[in-house]
């Protein structure tokens, strides 16, 4: 999947664009908004009717090296009595993000952009019932 | 990908940190995941905390289209299909990395940007505040 170039209908390429070898692109990995702190909801992963746990995956050849993945705790959902209700389903909600992958080839290193699918949390849904003839 | 010579001390001396600027291949390695959540699942309609999906488009960003979730209700849908205000629909938010064209409008020069997106909604028991 190639990153689409900006169409001429939108913009003219500025003169100030840096020279880039063919088939590649320049990527500054100093993250914009790196230090922004967002007020996230307090421990919704344990207060949800479809609660989830977090696992941290670590890979030194990936940037960022730490990616957090959620896993739904139950197949069903938690009812008002605190019991699992298997007539409902806990399902994962996923979102794509970009990472930079470092690959070693002998004494050379190359960098590749990669899309990673992150499970962000879980939600409780009514199941789809398939009626078998 | 684009190869870059390692340090003269290769293979013993390895820089564990990523350089500030890298040259990367224009092809993105992925699993060909479907980026339109409306097509990939109907959880947004079937959830007890349903949400709407809003298209956010920015030609200076890759991906240029990101779908933002907005919870439909303040409460959650109960077994009778009514909104139960004793529970709360809350957004599940995630920080993701995208590419920002830098300098602006340049076709092959980008910087990583961290953005906060609401991916979906989940139903939670509210935090009850007891006022003294």
């Amino acid at each position: 999947r190639k990153i689409p170039k900006v169409g001429h209908t939108f913009f003219q390429k500025p003169e100030s664009c840096p020279p880039v070898p063919g088939g590649s692109m320049k990527l500054d990995i100093g993250i914009i908004n790196e230090n922004q702190r967002v007020s996230m909801s307090r421990n919704i992963e344990s207060r949800s009717t479809s609660p989830w746990n977090y696992t941290v995956t670590w890979d030194p050849n990936r940037y960022p090296s730490e990616v957090v993945q959620a896993q739904c705790r139950n197949l069903g959902c938690i009812n008002a009595q605190g019991k699992e209700d298997i007539s409902m389903n806990s399902v994962p909600i996923q979102q794509e993000t970009l990472v930079v992958r470092r690959k070693h080839q002998g004494c050379s290193v190359s960098f590749q952009l990669e899309k990673v699918l992150v499970t962000v949390g879980c939600t409780c849904v009514t199941p789809v019932i398939h009626h078998v003839q | 990908g684009i190869t870059i010579p390692r340090n003269p001390g290769c293979p013993n001396s390895e820089d564990k940190n990523f350089p500030r600027t890298v040259m990367v291949n224009l092809n993105i390695h992925n699993r060909n995941t479907n980026t339109n959540p409306k097509r990939s699942s109907d959880y947004y309609n079937r959830s007890t905390s349903p949400w709407n999906l809003h298209r956010n488009e920015d030609p200076e960003r890759y991906p240029s289209v990101i779908w933002e979730a907005k919870c439909r209700h303040l409460g959650c849908i109960n077994a009778d299909g009514n909104v139960d205000y004793h529970m709360n629909s809350v957004p599940i938010q995630q920080e993701i990395l995208v590419l920002r064209r830098e300098p602006p409008h340049c076709p092959n020069s980008f910087r990583l940007e961290k953005i906060l997106v609401s991916v979906g909604c989940t139903c939670v028991t509210p935090i009850v505040h007891h006022v003294a």
Partner: nanobody, 125 residues
Framework: EVQLVESGGRLVQAGGSLRLPCAAS????????MGWFRQAPGKEREFVAA????????AYADFVRGRFTISRDDARNTVYLHMTSLKPEDTAVYYC??????????????????WGQGTQVTVSS
């Protein structure tokens, strides 16, 4: 930062109607629920109404249900409180409020981080 500015408050006869707009600027206000509160002289500030992020759902205090309606126009970054069948006891300063996270009940005052300066509504009998 979110800046909120309420307007539309004035003297109105009992049984009359008013529409209070609340214009938001700064951080995108569409990301979280918005609320209206009111404070009568010598009384605590109290919850009036709240609207969900999507605008598809709203919640109301019992004393205004059926008379007041909250709505939002994300294109204009504005939340409205439509007030009908006004009573003298609705006399108060009406405040618009925004929240930056949503993890508790929608009617709890401390969950709202940003407040407007208020607009005075007086209902005469």
């Amino acid at each position: 930062e979110v800046q909120l500015v309420e307007s539309g408050g004035r003297l109105v006869q009992a049984g009359g109607s008013l529409r209070l707009p609340c214009a938001a600027s700064g951080r995108t206000f569409t990301s979280y629920p918005m609320g209206w509160f009111r404070q009568a002289p010598g009384k605590e500030r109290e919850f009036v109404a709240a609207i969900s992020m999507s605008g598809d759902d709203a919640a109301y205090a019992d004393f205004v249900r059926g008379r007041f309606t909250i709505s939002r126009d994300d294109a204009r970054n504005t939340v409205y409180l439509h007030m009908t069948s006004l009573k003298p006891e609705d006399t108060a300063v009406y405040y618009c409020a925004a929240r930056t996270s949503y993890d508790g009940t929608y009617d709890y005052i401390d969950d709202y981080s940003y407040w407007g300066q208020g607009t005075q509504v007086t209902v005469s009998s």
